[in-house]
């Protein structure tokens, strides 16, 4: 309920609990197509990873908006895309074929882990520096859907390994707050 995602039309999209809408491609985004920037699909001959077949991470880079404010730097986020197991014969590790049944377990390419990133906002005429945190997908995975699964899993947070360094923030009186590198890169 609390998490909000950004769109580039200066409107905040406020998804419901457990939702994190996939951003549509927009003019001022750069999108790395899966074959260039995404994680390559697992090898189809690896039986244990057959459910991960062609789950891709698409990278979007965009400036985020919040009301009239814009992020000082673009933010890169992932969108999960692709099929988890094509509806055809899949060879397994010892040469036999395994039929992917449509009525079998439902695997989906969905967010596996999330991170939150602190973003410095630049606002028109605003004297005070403003920041916000955005929830971003950190990785994707094919997961068996249960009735508890939604489009994404709100509570499925995994800590990032890198700890950010504490940086000096702009002081309250500073006019036209400059972006602070440490603040922009405070990803969890």
């Amino acid at each position: 309920q609390g998490w909000q995602a950004f769109r580039n039309d200066a409107t905040e999209v406020i998804p419901g609990l457990g939702e994190y809408p996939e951003p549509p491609p927009e003019n001022n985004q750069t999108m790395n197509r899966a074959e260039n920037g995404g994680r390559p699909p697992h090898h189809p001959y690896d039986a244990k990873d057959v459910s991960e077949y062609s789950c891709r991470e698409l990278h979007y880079t965009r400036f985020l908006t919040d009301g009239p404010c814009r992020s000082a730097k673009p933010v890169t986020e992932l969108v999960c895309s692709g099929q988890c197991g094509p509806a055809r014969l899949l060879p397994n590790a010892i040469g036999r074929v395994k039929w992917w049944r449509p009525n079998g377990p439902d695997f989906r390419c969905i967010p596996d882990r999330y991170r939150a990133q602190r973003v410095q906002l630049l606002c028109p005429g605003g004297a005070a520096p403003r920041s916000r945190k955005v929830r971003l997908v950190a990785s994707c995975k094919c997961k068996r859907l249960t009735r508890f699964h939604n489009q994404s899993e709100l509570k499925d947070f995994g800590p990032e390994t890198a700890r950010p360094q504490k940086g000096r923030k702009p002081r309250p009186g500073a006019r036209g707050a400059k972006a602070n590198q440490a603040e922009l890169e405070n990803a969890y």
């Epitope: 609390g2 998490w3 909000q4 919040d66 009301g67 009239p68 939150a116 602190r118 606002c123 028109p124 005429g125 605003g126 004297a127 005070a128 520096p129 403003r130 920041s131 916000r132 945190k133 955005v134 929830r135 709100l154 509570k155 947070f157 950010p164 504490k166 940086g167 923030k169 309250p172 009186g173 440490a182 405070n186 969890y188």
Partner: antibody, heavy 118, light 107 residues
């Protein structure tokens, strides 16, 4: 479901300090900013400051600089606000609030009444 | 500090009435204004931010408008649960400041 549960009422003498706690559930505390706002009896709301639990960053309202300290324990998802050198004018309900931004207060605790009296 | 002056300080209205509360900033705050609702003995609740954006779950009868120094919160058709005190807040310049509140009472 986001919930903020604050510690109980306190009665303090002038010159003493008070430490109010705010237990956050529904998300990890470090994914938000923590704010503190107070309200004197029959009065309006007064912003005290915010903190970023992830990096220990804080910003205090100038009125409270030097008297207030905001900290968090991310292992228990609890925020703390300590106010020192209490005076009678500090008698108020103290609210913790949380939000994705440093400037608005999305979810609030139930409030903690602090009475300063000799 | 930027002063936020709310008017009226209190008003009486009936269920179904259209209610308008105004907030005037002592200097230009662009659209950096939020509105909160507070019921007796309870914590405030966020209603509106960026002057006109409704927060999650806030009924559409609540709307905000304005920019610069003059802001308005409108309740298009007052409901029994809307009797409360309403506060505006500016976040254009430190430190964030609130208006004095407008108490909406039953006529």
């Amino acid at each position: 479901q986001v919930q903020l549960v604050q510690s109980g009422a306190e009665v303090k003498k002038p010159g003493a300090s008070v430490k109010v706690s705010c237990k956050v559930s529904g998300f990890p505390i470090k994914h938000h900013f923590q704010h503190w706002v107070r309200q004197a009896p029959g009065k309006g709301l007064e912003w005290m400051g915010w903190s970023d639990p992830e990096i220990g960053d804080t910003e205090y309202a100038s009125k409270f600089q030097g008297r207030v300290t905001m900290t968090e324990d991310t292992s228990t998802d609890t925020a703390y606000m300590e106010l020192s050198s209490l005076r009678s004018e500090d008698t108020a309900v103290y609210y913790c609030a949380t939000g994705h931004t440093t400037y608005k207060f999305d979810f609030w605790g139930q409030g903690t009444t602090v009475t300063v009296s000799s | 500090d930027i002063q936020m002056t709310q008017s009226p300080s209190s008003l009486s209205a009936s269920v179904g009435d259209r209610v308008t509360i105004t907030c005037k900033a002592s200097q230009d705050v662009h659209t950096a204004v939020a509105w909160y609702q507070q019921k007796p003995g309870k914590a405030p609740k966020l209603l509106i931010y960026w002057a006109s954006t409704r927060w999650t779950g806030v009924p559409s009868r609540f709307s905000g408008s304005g920019s610069g120094t003059d802001f308005t919160l409108t309740i298009s058709s007052l409901q029994p649960e809307d009797f409360a005190t309403y506060y505006c807040q500016q976040y254009s310049d430190y430190h964030w400041t609130f208006g004095g509140g407008t108490k909406v009472e039953i006529k």
